[in-house]
């Protein structure tokens, strides 16, 4: 950090490595929860027009696809992978692509993905060819 920039105590808004290099924040689609027409497709675009700067540099992009008897929704956000989201760990946070994995949620079909390249949650991928691990 440059000498004229104060380093505050307990600052999670800036992440540095051992050499003092600074991590830039992620750019993610961030529309929270929106109704979606994405269904039975290998991949979908988020149709979210808002690309936001994540508040903290350690945050990654997340997408959550949910289907129940009434509707389908797609949620796009930034989130810290050290913290669970919807009670699930973001195990794929280092991935450059948002590869959807099914999670067990009663009463609905629930898929979630996370990734760490710019706007990577704009293109959500359900295709089996990308999934190398079993869903939870």
């Amino acid at each position: 950090i440059p000498p004229h920039v104060q380093k505050s105590v307990n600052n999670d808004m800036i992440v540095t490595d051992n050499n003092g290099a600074v991590k830039f924040p992620q750019l993610c689609k961030f529309c929270d929860v929106r109704f979606s027409t994405c269904d039975n497709q290998k991949s979908c675009m988020s149709n979210c027009s808002i690309t936001s700067i994540c508040e903290k540099p350690q945050e990654v992009c997340v997408a959550v696809w949910r289907k129940n008897d009434e509707n389908i929704t797609l949620e796009t956000v930034c989130h810290d992978p050290k913290l669970p989201y919807h009670d699930f760990i973001l195990e794929d946070a280092a991935s450059p692509k948002c590869i959807m994995k099914e999670k067990k949620k009663p009463g609905e079909t629930f898929f979630m993905c996370s990734c760490s390249s710019d706007e990577c949650n704009d293109n959500i991928i359900f295709s089996e060819e990308y999934n190398t691990s079993n869903p939870d």
């Epitope: 950090i1 440059p2 050499n19 003092g20 600074v22 991590k23 830039f24 750019l27 390249s117 710019d118």
Partner: nanobody, 124 residues
Framework: EVQLLESGGGLVQPGGSLRLSCAAS???????RMWWVRQAPGKGLEWVS?????????YYAKSVTGRFTISRDNSKNTLYLQMNSLRAEDTAVYYC?????????????????WGQGTLVTVSS
């Protein structure tokens, strides 16, 4: 020598406007994503806005969306931040910085060179 020189800060009343400038030299301006970053007194850095080198795609933190507008003039090697509807919580030192698009980390602890910053104080 790489230089980033911010200007345009000052004292403004809540609801007022300011336009910050950042004059860049010593590097190929059109190769870099440019950022405005701010630091409020006693607080950490907040990433305010960014703009792509070509095509002028822009990005904003949620806290400033709809109030701030980032722009750049590649012919003048200058970055701008138009700040409207200013609030007390916008009081901070504002820095510009440069990033090679796609690179996650700066090359060194000087954020690929910072400017010295310009102080914005929003107070009645």
């Amino acid at each position: 020598e790489v230089q980033l020189l911010e200007s345009g800060g000052g004292l403004v009343q809540p609801g007022g406007s300011l336009r910050l400038s950042c004059a860049a030299s010593g590097f190929t301006f059109t190769e870099y994503r440019m950022w405005w970053v701010r630091q409020a007194p006693g607080k950490g850095l907040e990433w305010v806005s960014a703009i792509e080198p070509i095509g002028n795609r822009t990005y904003y933190a949620k806290s400033v969306t709809g109030r701030f507008t980032i722009s750049r003039d590649n012919s003048k090697n200058t970055l701008y931040l138009q700040m409207n509807s200013l609030r007390a919580e916008d009081t901070a030192v504002y820095y510009c910085a440069k990033q090679i698009p796609g690179r996650k980390w700066t090359a060194n602890s000087r954020f690929d060179y910072w400017g010295q910053g310009t102080l914005v104080t929003v107070s009645s």
